[in-house]
Amino acid sequence: MMTGTIETTGNISAEKGGSIILQCHLSSTTAQVTQVNWEQQDQLLAICNADLGWHISPSFKDRVAPGPGLGLTLQSLTVNDTGEYFCIYHTYPDGTYTGRIFLEVLESSVAEHGARFQIP
């Protein structure tokens, strides 16, 4: 039975040209995390595997940095980076947990962080 929950940074915003940290946290389970995938709806950004370490998708190599922790740092943001991001936790024995973050990249210098929320 899957008892865990994923807490994410929720809806966040950042300035064009800046950087942002995408963070998720899996709690309420003793399951072992074997791999975390960071994905957009139609594109794998990176994986962090317990054995293989970090692997960044080649097309994002120049502007995605691993960490901190199991999070992901997006750099040199453009308005095209606006959209949904997913942290996908592969765990044993529970299975797969998915968290969602919505990032809005703003032209202006006003960029506030949204509230944290949980996805069961």
């Epitope: 074997t34 794998l44 595997n49 293989l52 370490g53 998915t98």
Partner: antibody, heavy 121, light 113 residues
């Protein structure tokens, strides 16, 4: 163009070890994972393990843990798969394959030509 | 580990006819959060390495003829060749692309009747 060039056929005695090489060219070696897969005569495909040349980290099929060792040499863009304590059931064609990112998926997009390993006394 | 089971083991189809190969996984390959199925199909001809045909259960690899199509979701998947050509004689494998180990099905040998 992307190429994976594997070493030549090997004949080994039971209990010996074999080391198969896979030289990559035509792309940035450290940006892609390299997988190893084998195929016994007339049989299907069996995943052995994978290496991340960027980090040096490797992961193995439980069946081969302790007997298979996958390494990578960044200076020569070459991956290696060593299998020890060989037995007759290890007679197979051994393939290396590059893992490309296709949308959301990790896909074995380019393959070596295969290396035949025969284990016989 | 995820176990991939293909059926049938072998299949003989007349030229121009439809060929259907099934693949069943022991665990779901669907990530419902992003609605993606992590399943790939490969074709292998004698003496050659496998060649990617389909990924994401239904997306054709560039250059693959449109007579090849993939369908299914969760644990049940199908590869269909709408009109068999002589060059399609090969062994076809499905692969779990969801989590390591990236296990393969046992293969389906496709021949001409």
């Amino acid at each position: 163009q992307v190429q994976l060039q594997q070493s030549g056929a090997e004949v080994k005695k039971p209990g010996a070890s074999v080391k198969v090489s896979c030289k990559a060219s035509g792309y940035a070696f450290t940006n892609y994972l390299i997988e190893w897969v084998r195929q016994a005569p007339g049989q299907g495909l069996e995943w052995i393990g994978v290496i991340n040349p960027g980090s040096g980290g490797s992961k193995y099929n439980e069946k081969f843990k302790g007997r298979a060792t996958i390494t990578a040499d960044k200076s020569t863009s070459t991956a290696y798969m060593e299998l020890s304590s060989l037995r007759s059931e290890d007679t197979a064609v051994y393939f290396c394959a590059r893992t490309g990112v296709y949308g959301n998926f990790l896909i074995f997009d380019y393959w070596g030509q295969g290396t035949t390993v025969t284990v016989s006394s | 580990d995820i176990v991939m089971t293909q059926s049938p083991d072998s299949l003989a189809v007349s030229l121009g006819e439809r060929a259907t190969i099934n693949c069943k996984s022991s665990q779901s390959l669907l990530n419902s959060g992003i609605q993606k199925n992590y399943l790939a199909w490969y074709q292998q001809k004698p003496g050659q390495p496998p060649k990617l045909l389909i990924y994401g259960a239904s997306t054709r690899e560039s250059g693959v003829p449109d007579r090849f199509s993939g369908s299914g979701s969760g644990t049940d998947f199908t590869l269909t060749i709408s009109s068999l050509q002589a060059e399609d004689v090969a062994v076809y494998y499905c692969q779990n692309d969801h989590r390591y180990p990236f296990t393969f099905g046992g293969g389906t040998k496709l021949e001409i009747k």
